[in-house]
């Protein structure tokens, strides 16, 4: 009978092993080993045994020991099991962005590795095991499907192989793929909310606000705002899960008409858009014309208001007759009209909205100077030693200068409190003077002496 030792060997690929072949008789006729592996007899052997060194063992093999004894021929095999770790452990690329709530399929490919019975493939999230499967096929492919939540954003996924040769070899061989970071996103199905003026006047500034809630991760979201061909430059404010993009928009005459305002929020590989129509219009303020802005009293003045051809005007609150873009009226200028405002209000309908423009002109009426009995009484009688305030008001535009002099040398303190003395008595010549001329009026002051009983 032929014996082999060891009967089983686990060795690394390319490794060497010593195998002892022995015969049961003392003097075998022949004793040897049959193997395709490179072998070397280790001398000296014994009468009934030989030691062989097998090298460069690349794959599982069963070398056979044989012996020929007087009682017959026999053989025995040793089982060589080769182990090696996989040459490639690779996690298939993850999608650049993974929507929250959608399942993610993780796929791992393992090339090589033996013995396969001892080779396990694991899919990991960080260090947490998601799936453990045997390696089957070449290359071995292992898949698992996992639900994706917001907390998976930024998580590392990898694939690990375990070659467990225990208890034969007190070793656990691990190979781990390069990790892949997952980027998750959550873009709600609702479109962004767009707040903007429905109508916008040429050369004026409007504000557009686009906002969306329920975004994750909000910092990765991008906003695109455009009015027609004009890209807007918004200022973006981020909340916890929301963003608000605010932009100023100024439109020119070339953009007059209907324009599309577009707000797009891009996150991951998805976009949510909102479109709105904005009507750009041109509406100059109406013109208020006075035949002359400064006239002398008694002059006829034509007040005219003219606006946009499609506008309807009101002049000083009175609508044009028939309703339209022009209105006018005639007046004879009086002092009461000095400083009078003529206001023209024009109304234009733009995209169902009424827009208003006003223009005001002031009329200056030149009149006077005037000194009337009502405002400058011709006679004052005052008790001696009493406190009095001489009043004399000159009227006119431009406002006249006023002086009241007695004998050209004594002024009467108009509008000032005076103590009445004999010196105050007399006739004063009051003169009101402006660039339009001069008027005079005599004012007499009488001083009553106190009666002594």
């Amino acid at each position: 009978q032929t014996s082999v030792f060891p009967p089983e060997v686990i060795l690394p690929r390319g490794g060497s092993v010593k195998v002892n072949c022995s015969a049961s008789c003392d003097q075998p006729i022949s004793l040897g080993m049959e193997t395709p592996l490179p072998k070397k007899e280790i001398l000296p052997g014994g009468n009934n045994w030989k030691m062989y060194e097998l090298s460069n063992v690349q794959e599982d093999s069963q070398p056979m020991c044989y012996s020929n004894c007087p009682d017959g021929q026999s053989s025995a095999k040793t089982l060589l099991t080769v182990y090696w770790t996989p040459e490639r452990v690779e996690l298939a690329p993850l999608p650049p962005w993974q929507p929250v709530g959608k399942n993610l399929t993780l796929r791992c490919q393992v090339e090589g590795g033996a013995p396969r019975a001892n080779l396990t493939v694991m899919l990991l999230r960080g260090e947490k095991e998601l799936s453990r499967q045997s390696a089957v096929g070449e290359p071995a492919e292992v898949t698992t499907t996992v639900p994706v939540g917001r907390d998976d954003h930024g998580a590392n996924f990898s694939c690990r192989t375990e070659l467990d040769l225990r208890p034969y070899v007190l070793k656990l061989f691990e190979n781990t793929s390069a990790p892949h970071q997952l980027q998750t996103f959550d873009l709600p199905a609702t479109p962004p909310q767009l707040v903007s003026p429905q109508v916008l006047e040429v050369d004026t500034q409007g504000t557009v606000v686009c906002s969306l809630d329920g975004l994750f991760p909000v910092s990765e979201a991008q906003v695109s705002l455009a009015l027609g061909d004009q890209k807007l430059n918004p200022t973006i404010t981020y909340g916890n899960n929301s963003l608000s993009a605010k932009a100023s928009v100024k439109v020119t005459a070339e953009e007059e008409g209907t324009q599309q305002l577009l707000c797009g929020v891009m996150l991951g590989n998805q976009t949510q858009e909102t479109r709105q129509t904005v009507t750009i219009y041109s509406f100059p303020a109406p013109n208020v014309n006075l035949t002359k802005p400064e006239v002398s009293e008694g002059t006829e003045v034509i007040v005219e208001c003219e606006a946009h051809p499609r506008a309807k005007v009101m002049l000083n609150g009175v609508p044009a007759q028939p309703p339209g873009p022009r209105a006018q009226f005639l007046l004879k200028a009086t002092p009461e009209d000095n400083g009078r405002s003529f206001s023209c209000s024009a109304t234009l309908e733009v995209a169902g909205q009424l827009v208003h423009k006003n223009q005001t002109r002031e009329l200056r009426v030149l009149y006077g100077p005037r000194l009337d009995e009502k405002d400058c009484p011709g006679n004052w009688t005052w008790p001696e030693n009493s406190q009095q305030t001489p009043m004399c008001q000159a009227w006119g535009n431009p406002l006249p200068q006023l002086k009241c002099l007695k004998d050209g040398t004594f002024p009467l303190p108009i509008g000032q409190s005076v103590t009445v003395t004999r010196d105050l008595e007399g006739t004063y010549l009051c003169q009101a003077r402006s660039t339009r001329g001069e008027v005079t009026r005599e004012v007499t002051v009488n001083v009553l002496s106190p009666r002594y009983e």
Epitope: Q401, D407, G408, T409, F410, P411, P413, Q416
Partner: antibody, heavy 117, light 110 residues
């Protein structure tokens, strides 16, 4: 409209001197005329005024020593018994008490009176 | 008597500076006060009337204020051309007067 003084010059103490102010471009019946003097290196000194009604008013120190009178186009200042202290430039002024703008504050260029024996 | 007291008699001021001249009436003259500027060898130039009204052609640097018995002439951003003697004159009473003019203030600009 203008005013101009004349009649200044050298006068002996105790004599009599009359200065004349000739006006043009306005009527003395509607304007008061005053006389102001200024001794060499000294300040302005008010002498008196003649009103539009011909009434005269004098500074307290000038009463009795000066007399103001007028015709239709001239205003005279008569200095009685001048002393060396009356040596000064004498100005004729229209409407010194008017409260209108400067067109009514016409000053003549002044005439120099020197009192010396 | 309606007499005028003017202070100071003289003042020195740097170009660009501000000068203030005061004038006091012995009794109320309301707002009937005028200010004059006089340069050597020239007749007085009318600056301000009715205490605060600036005569035409006078720079706005000249400002008058006051009423009753206390009056002030302020010259701001003084220029070298402002070197002169300044007089106040009461324009209220032509009788009962010693002198209708203040004694004058000589302004020297350095």
């Amino acid at each position: 409209q203008s005013v101009e003084e004349s009649g200044g010059g050298l006068v002996k103490p105790g004599g009599t001197l009359t200065l004349t102010c000739t006006v043009s471009g306005f009527s003395l019946s509607t304007h008061a005329m005053g006389w102001v003097r200024q001794a060499p290196g000294k300040g302005l000194e008010y002498i008196g005024i003649i009103g539009s009604s011909d009434r005269t008013y004098y500074a307290s120190w000038a009463k009795g020593r000066f007399t103001i009178s007028k015709t239709s186009t001239t205003v005279d200042l008569k200095i009685t018994s001048p002393t060396t202290e009356d040596t000064a430039t004498y100005f004729c002024v229209r409407d010194p008490y008017d409260s209108f703008d400067d067109g009514y504050r016409l000053w003549g260029p002044g005439t120099l009176v020197t009192v010396s024996s | 008597a309606y007499d005028m007291t003017q202070t100071p008699a003289s003042v020195e001021v740097a170009v660009g500076g501000t000068v203030t001249i005061k004038c006091q009436a012995s009794q109320s003259i309301y707002s009937y006060l005028s200010w004059y500027q006089q340069k050597p060898g020239q007749r007085p130039k009318f600056l301000i009337y009715d205490a605060s009204k600036v005569a035409s052609g006078v720079p706005s640097r000249f400002k008058g204020s006051g009423s009753g018995t206390e009056f002030t002439l302020t010259i701001s951003a003084v220029q070298s051309d402002d070197a002169a003697t300044y007089y106040c004159q009461q324009a209220y009473s032509s009788s009962n007067v010693d002198n209708a003019f203040g004694g004058g203030t000589e302004v020297m600009v350095k």
